[in-house]
């Protein structure tokens, strides 16, 4: 296919950063300012993305690659190639249509983005809650309640040294 394309398309070898100029008998011409072509054989150059408003420039446009944007402080990227910027919230909050709201009891968010998620249900794994959850942190599950019965310890002490030939008590 590539060979066929090369033989049929007089523009196939114009390099990236140029375009095949139909107004000049299909010779290669450089991309004009504020435009780019990232692949060879292009008949036009694409307009560079402009990072304005809540967007800021992470990488400048060049003749062979588009500009890349990220978000100003207080916002984070969403979508492919940072197509949108969404407001940050504090840890322990989530963004709703009415703005940042604290996580409901029983949920947490340890990031500045995303939604509040339910605390882990330790009992589903047969474990107990070792550290309670907060709006910002999930619960920490500990050993199962049976392991913490009287006389039992969650930390196993080292076995005492025994003389050879003696069986355990």
């Amino acid at each position: 296919f590539e060979r066929t394309r090369s033989l049929q398309d007089p523009c196939s070898n114009c390099p990236a950063g140029t375009f095949c100029d139909n107004n000049r008998n299909q010779i290669c011409s450089p991309c004009p300012p504020n435009s780019f072509s990232s692949a060879g054989g292009q008949r036009t150059c694409d307009i560079c993305r402009q990072c304005k408003g809540v967007f800021r420039t992470r990488k400048e446009c060049s003749s062979t690659s588009n500009a890349e944007c990220d978000c100003t402080p207080g916002f984070h990227c969403l979508g492919a190639g940072c197509s949108m910027c969404e407001q940050d919230c504090k840890q322990g909050q989530e963004l709703t249509k009415k703005g940042c709201k604290d996580c409901c009891f029983g949920t947490f968010n340890d990031q500045k983005r995303g939604i509040c998620r339910p605390w882990t249900n330790c009992s589903l794994d047969g474990k107990s809650v070792l550290v309670n959850g907060t709006k910002e942190r999930d619960v920490v599950c500990g050993p199962s309640p049976a392991d913490l019965s009287p006389g039992a310890s969650s930390v196993t002490p080292p076995a005492p040294a025994r003389e050879p030939g003696h069986s355990p008590q």
Epitope: S6, L7, D9, P10, C11, S12, N13, C14, P15, G17, T18, C20, R24, N25, Q26, I27, C28, S29, P30, G41
Partner: nanobody, 121 residues
Amino acid sequence: EVQLLESGGGEVQPGGSLRLSCAASGFSFSINAMGWYRQAPGKRREFVAAIYSGRNTVYAESVKGRFTISRDNAKNTVYLQMSSLRAEDTAVYYCGLLKGNRVVSPSVAYWGQGTLVTVKP
């Protein structure tokens, strides 16, 4: 406006050498492929040699090992060094700006006016 101006032609004896030049203007020289063609009296114009923007070269079988194409992007000039010239090399030599940087099956976007090379004893 694209301009291609050949020079360096003349009369030479068989076995002799000549260097043709083609000064280019009016376009981005360094990113385009350039070629040399020739037309002998009563014959069709034929491909001689071409050079890509990346300096890869292609030659007609009849001139391989005798002719060398080169380019100087700083001077916007393409050259054809011809040695071991034969009577059958007699022709008007044309510089061509190739469409779309193509060297495989090249098609020419713009031509120069040509320079005459005569090889005779």
